[in-house]
């Protein structure tokens, strides 16, 4: 028991999450590429999950898409409309921890 | 206690104008979404604009733009509704709401003020 | 703008009844759907967010729920008090559009 102790003492010890950068808000125009950035980092590598006012993120086909980067993730919205306008959160989880980061598309 | 308080309704001519305010009190005015949201007598409601409070963002419904304009004044912790050009569809009770940083979930509401546009 | 069609626009039903009102929009709003009750000549109040997330100081016989597009508010068994106009709302895109409204009547 003392030993299986260590280990799990000694894993915990490695694991962290870390919001290596808060999220900007972005005002845009009408037509343009937005893109938001997730900076984070952690041990075991975190999941990332986008939120848009409060609710998960809908890809769209060729305009709204995210994907896993070395820094985290990364949000994009092609063409901009109007009804992008939000609250736009990422949240990041290693399965202990968990960082969220907000910003407003304007 | 959270509080918002619409004045300034009243009776005008079509192509007149009124200044809505919307007072607020009890909540921290610049962290929230303030909108306008109208009801013509018996129908449904009707989004008419919001302003980001901490940002200046304003966004208009079609039906109101460039004939409204939305505005905020957080020293005072009120918020606007410009009304120019008022037509007969406008007569509506117009009331404001507010929206928590994160989300466009109305969870506050005044009591709302009339407009009637009418000659 | 989204469209959410609210059905059925009235109902007529007795105290303790389960009562089920429907929103379906016209595309994904992904979870972002509100729900509010309004009474006459009374600004309206919000009972649930995020499609199934009741607020505070909602009774617990209102609930809300989601399959896709399609978005429910059930009312588990109707008090006297719940006699009101039902309106969903969608969030996700700007602006925020409304359904056009249940109203729950006494039968």
């Known amino acids: 028991p003392t030993s299986s102790w260590n280990i799990s003492s000694e894993l915990n010890k490695d694991s962290y999450l870390t919001l290596d950068e808060p999220m900007n808000n972005i005002t845009t125009s009408l037509g343009q590429t937005a893109e938001l950035h997730c900076k984070v980092s952690g041990n075991p590598p975190p999941t990332i999950r986008w939120f848009k006012n409060d609710a998960p993120v809908v890809q769209e086909p060729r305009r709204l898409s995210f994907r896993s980067t070395i820094y985290g993730s990364r949000l994009r919205i092609r063409n901009l409309d109007t009804t992008d306008t939000g609250y736009f959160q990422c949240v990041a989880t290693n399965g202990k921890e968990v960082v969220s980061s907000t910003g407003v598309l304007f | 206690e959270v509080q918002l308080v619409e004045s300034g309704g009243g009776l005008v001519q079509p192509g007149g104008s009124l200044r809505l305010s919307c007072a607020a009190s009890?909540?921290?005015?610049?962290?929230?979404?303030i909108h306008w949201v109208r009801q013509a007598p018996g129908k449904g409601l009707e989004w008419v604009a919001y302003?980001?409070?901490?940002?200046?963002?304003?966004y208009y419904a079609d039906s109101v733009k460039g004939r409204f304009t939305i505005s905020a004044d957080t020293s005072k912790n009120t918020a606007y509704l410009q009304m120019n050009s008022l037509r007969a569809e406008d007569t509506a009770v117009y009331y404001c709401?507010?929206?928590?940083?994160?989300?466009?979930?109305?969870?506050?509401w005044g009591q709302g003020t009339l407009v009637t546009v009418s000659s | 703008d989204i469209q959410m069609t609210q059905s059925p626009s009235s109902l007529s039903a007795s105290v303790g009844d389960r009562v089920t009102i429907t929103c379906r929009a016209s595309?994904?709003?992904?979870?972002?759907v509100a729900w509010y009750q309004q009474k006459p000549g009374k600004a309206p109040k919000l009972l649930i967010y995020?499609?199934?997330s009741l607020y505070s100081g909602v009774p617990s016989r209102f609930s809300g729920s989601r399959s896709g597009t399609d978005f429910t508010l059930t009312i588990s068994s109707l008090q006297p008090e719940d006699f009101a106009t039902y309106y969903c709302?969608?969030?996700?895109?700007?602006?925020?559009?409304f359904g056009q409204g249940t109203k729950v009547e006494i039968k």
């Open positions: 709401a507010r929206s928590p940083y994160g989300t466009f979930a109305l969870d506050y």
């Open positions: 009890g909540f921290t005015f610049d962290s929230y979404v």
């Open positions: 302003i980001f409070s901490f940002g200046g963002y304003t």
């Open positions: 595309q994904s709003v992904s979870s972002a």
């Open positions: 995020s499609a199934s």
């Open positions: 709302q969608q969030y996700y895109y700007t602006p925020g559009t």
